[in-house]
């Protein structure tokens, strides 16, 4: 007899066939915290920009992705130092001069305010109450971020 | 009254919450490959190094990590042109003066036999046929992964 | 406990080395970016170089480039820093200091040893 | 190089008053700034980073304001241990990290 588990195996897949939806997550893996439809990992050790964003592509996660102002407070909120930075998913793209998500979508400028230059070799790290450009090199903390509800249609095409 | 889908929501938190187990892929999303216990995904598209793993980790996937030689020849079988080179997630750390997997772990030199030089800005490819180091600005295909199974407390502690 | 402690100091005469370590202990070396701090006899202080937890970066203070060299060696908890062609005015107690973690190259000085002095004398 | 000027660079005060120390910076550091104390013979100890948030462990008599050139250091009731010397220090992201001149709190 088949486990509720497994059960739900073919349950999920018949939906995904119907809908091209892939299992989402359901809720967020122990140690993350949820907010909104994100899970989100800050990391308590330091490393480069590059590195971080290994760490959470090995976790089969992102550097986080901020979509709006409301959002980057939300996050904010959740860190406890003011002088604390973690790393995002938001670097200087030298060949598009311009700001660039690790999602392939620009800035829209009017979301974050930046202090700092915007420059080759230039990443991007939240503080308690601000938003920084740094070098890349430089070694701090990171958030990794993991979509918590299944989307539909999701079906990952190259970016 | 739930449909099966909130039901296996139910199911797999309280099967999380007893084993600390994440709610992991059942299945493999529409247009991944299954190769044993992993999903892969091989782009269409081009990218350097950098952006390849950018995308996987937008994708809440890894670069593809390579465990020994048989996993290697069963990926490299899934290549249908001998002549396509694919990223994998193994670049040269030039601190360490070695070849490194995303995940932080060192390559075994018996694992994979790799043409070319270990030296900075050095990224590893896969063929049909061969291993090869290259320029990790170089643009070419690349391959993600997700881990198909649930593992028993993946817990995701920094690296 | 949480500690730094300097030892290679002493006198040299001008032109000569020195090599000055710093032993950590009681908190997570590897995750810190580490510097050494100076300060003359009746002076102020002055920073002289820092090196980023993983050795990657590292800077100096204009006044010692080219004849001073900070290490680290993660594994030993330790700090180094080689001091060459020395001159009257390296004279000073040197400190090791600790930045608060994570504030990337904004290096705030949380932690301190109690200094080491250098003399260089004919 | 952002060059930090204290003022005064010596004060005489008594148990009980309230102290106020100011450093300006040749050009703005938004808020990077700490201020350190420091006793004869002792090390350097860190009250105030980020130019307001108060150090673990540090009374709270002690407080930190401003942002981009001009900054404070308050001290509201003078204690008989805060005699010292306090320096305040820039910590932009771009080395050299250059320290105040100083200033020398005396007893009156």
């Known amino acids: 007899q088949k486990s509720s588990i497994e059960k739900c195996s073919v349950d999920i897949q018949q939906s995904r066939n119907k809908t091209t939806e892939r299992p989402g997550l359901l809720n967020c893996p122990i140690y993350w915290q949820q907010l909104r439809e994100k899970c989100l990992l800050f990391s308590h050790t330091v490393n480069p920009w590059n590195n971080s964003l290994a760490d959470c592509s090995t976790k089969e996660s992102s550097l986080l992705l901020i979509r709006d102002k409301d959002e980057l407070i939300h996050t904010q909120n959740l860190i406890r130092d003011k002088a604390i930075l973690f790393w995002i998913g938001l670097n200087f793209s030298l060949s598009e001069k311009n700001w660039k998500w690790i999602n392939g979508s620009f800035l829209n400028s009017n979301d974050l305010e930046i202090r700092g230059d915007a420059k080759e070799n230039s990443c991007i790290s939240i503080s308690q109450t601000s938003v920084y450009s740094e070098y890349c090199s430089t070694e701090i903390r990171w958030i990794c971020q993991k979509e918590l509800t299944p989307v539909r249609n999701k079906v990952y095409p190259d970016s | 009254q739930k449909s099966s889908i909130e039901k296996c929501s139910v199911d797999i938190q309280q099967s999380r919450n007893k084993t600390t187990e994440r709610p992991g892929l059942l299945n493999c999303p529409i247009y991944w490959q299954q190769l044993r216990e992993k999903c892969l995904l091989f782009s269409h598209t081009v990218n350097p190094w950098n952006n390849s793993l950018a995308d996987c980790s937008t994708k809440e996937s890894s670069l593809l990590l390579i465990r020994d030689k048989d996993e290697l020849i069963h990926t490299q079988n899934l290549i249908r042109d001998k002549a396509i080179l694919f990223w994998i997630g193994l670049n040269f750390s030039l601190s360490e003066k070695n070849w490194k997997w995303i995940n932080g772990s060192f390559l075994n030199s018996n694992d994979l036999e790799i043409r070319g030089d270990a030296k900075e800005n050095s990224c590893i490819s896969i063929s049909q046929t061969s291993v090869y180091s290259e320029y990790c600005s170089t643009e070419i295909r690349w391959i993600c992964q997700k881990e198909l199974t649930p593992v028993r407390n993946k817990v995701y502690p920094d690296s | 406990q949480v500690q730094l402690v300097e030892s290679g100091g002493g006198l040299v005469k001008p032109g000569g080395s020195l090599r000055l370590s710093c032993a950590a202990s009681?908190?997570?070396?590897?995750?810190?970016?580490m510097s050494w701090i100076r300060q003359a006899p009746g002076k102020g202080l002055e920073w002289v170089s820092y090196i980023s937890p993983s050795g990657a970066t590292i800077y100096y203070a204009d006044s010692v480039k080219g004849r001073f060299t900070i290490s680290r060696d993660n594994a030993k908890n330790s700090l180094y820093l080689q001091m060459n062609s020395l001159r009257a005015e390296d004279t000073a107690v040197y400190y090791c200091?600790?930045?608060?973690?994570?504030?990337?190259?904004?290096?705030?000085?949380?932690?301190w040893g109690r200094g080491t002095l250098v003399t260089v004398s004919s | 190089d952002i060059q930090l000027t204290q003022s005064p660079s010596s004060v005489s005060a008594s148990v009980g008053d309230r102290v106020t120390i100011t450093c300006r910076a040749s050009?703005?550091?938004?808020?990077?700034l700490a201020w350190y104390q420091q006793k004869p013979g002792k090390a350097p100890k860190l009250l105030i980073y980020?130019?307001?948030s108060l150090q673990s462990g540090v009374p709270s008599r002690f407080s930190g304001s401003g942002s981009g050139t001009d900054f404070t250091l308050t001290i509201s009731s003078l204690q008989p241990e805060d005699f010292a010397t306090y320096y305040c220090?820039?910590?932009?992201?771009?080395?050299?990290?250059?320290f105040g001149g100083g200033t020398k709190v005396e007893i009156k």
């Open positions: 220090q820039q910590v932009t992201s771009t080395p050299p990290y250059t």
């Open positions: 980020a130019a307001s």
């Open positions: 050009q703005g550091i938004s808020s990077w």
């Open positions: 009681g908190f997570t070396f590897p995750q810190y970016y």
């Open positions: 200091a600790r930045s608060l973690m994570s504030t990337g190259t904004h290096l705030y000085f949380d932690l």
